[in-house]
Amino acid sequence: HTAAQDNCTCPTNKMTVCSPDGPGGRCQCRALGSGMAVDCSTLTSKCLLLKARMSAPKNARTLVRPSEHALVDNDGLYDPDCDPEGRFKARQCNQTSVCWCVNSVGVRRTDKGDLSLRCDELVRTHHILIDLRHRPTAGAFNHSDLDAELRRLFRERYRLHPKFVAAVHYEQPTIQIELRQNTSQKAAGDVDIGDAAYYFERDIKGESLFQGRGGLDLRVRGEPLQVERTLIYYLDEIPPKFSMKRLTA
């Protein structure tokens, strides 16, 4: 697909190998791990990025209270199965034939089972709540400046349409970014909120996925915004199905 022709690299994904053997001898970039060609003009899907990562040599009322159905990614890294479009397959299994169902961002949404476990459809994560705590600063950031800067970041760095950034909440030192994107709202070519959130998460951790760019330098009116803790909550269009044992644990 498209890539920087002069030196044949993928600006939006450093977890690729690019070579001049694409159509017409053009630069073509393939994700590590899956070997799938990626479109370097946009973000790569989280599933392909995880696969590449596993294969690579390596005021109170303004804050949102995550719903009881919100998922947090407690399982950490795994080597996912991706579908032909690079999205997560609804059912994931490990080497020991333990299987579970995931949502569109690859987070487990059922108890673990065996190979007989059925996951009928990939359930879409339509609401993502990114909960950040910033390091102490001389004073609180101006809310509207912070809001504008984070919206600009998601629009320009992650190419996420502004309409999908539903809200930015702030109560020092906590910042919450709400991303919302229903199946019906997502048009062809739109960046997925799950992919944008994953790129943002890796940026915040100082593990940028962008090729050759410096790390994320977030500033609000010239003041550095340094994040010391990140929590991401995922809300699915259909609530997850966990046993009572887990819910009461």
């Epitope: 044949c8 190998v17 070579s19 053997d21 159509p23 590590l32 070997g35 060609a37």
Partner: antibody
Framework: QVQLVQSGAEVKKPGASVKVSCKAS????????IGWVKQAPGQGLEWIGD????????NYNEKFKGRATLTADTSASTAYMELSSLRSEDTAVYYC?????????WGQGTLVTVSS | DIVMTQSPDSLAVSLGERATINCRAS??????????MHWYQQKPGQPPKLLIK???NLESGVPDRFSGSGSGTDFTLTISSLQAEDVAVYYC?????????FGQGTKLEIK
Amino acid sequence: QVQLVQSGAEVKKPGASVKVSCKASGYTFTNYWIGWVKQAPGQGLEWIGDIYPGGGYTNYNEKFKGRATLTADTSASTAYMELSSLRSEDTAVYYCARGTGGGDYWGQGTLVTVSS
Amino acid sequence: DIVMTQSPDSLAVSLGERATINCRASQSVSTSSYSYMHWYQQKPGQPPKLLIKYASNLESGVPDRFSGSGSGTDFTLTISSLQAEDVAVYYCQHSWEIPYTFGQGTKLEIK
């Protein structure tokens, strides 16, 4: 002009290993994937895996994972395919090719015979 | 793994006539821009030779009687006017995802 020259035929005993080489010339070796393909006598083509010499990245067909090892020596512009724990069904011609799918240049092939 | 199925397994065509070989993938191997499908010719005792890359791009030096078409899961290699030197086995291969599997081959002969 682009050329891929492979090492000569080998006869091996079951359980042994074989290492086939593929010497590239006429292009920048580190810029292209090198793929390896097996062709058993009278049979079709089977993709083994590929290697990107520029970074040493490898991909393997699950069927050959654990037995096939792909390496490259960039100073010698040479790619290698080592196959271990040989058995009779490994008797085949092994080809190297430049490129991922759609290999545009191929080596002449190396016949590996596994026989006790 | 993506399974590539060629049809027919063998084909006999008169000199000067059109030869058509089909290849079906078990899932789509196309995006809106490209199809990751390639065609090879192999003659006895020789390595495969790339004819068509990305479904329809003719490799340089390949006669223009060879053409490729198709997208999604169904692809076709066509030889518009068969010549004696076209007798060979033809293979399709995808490069959508690992492993990059081949079709089983189609043997083309002169009728």
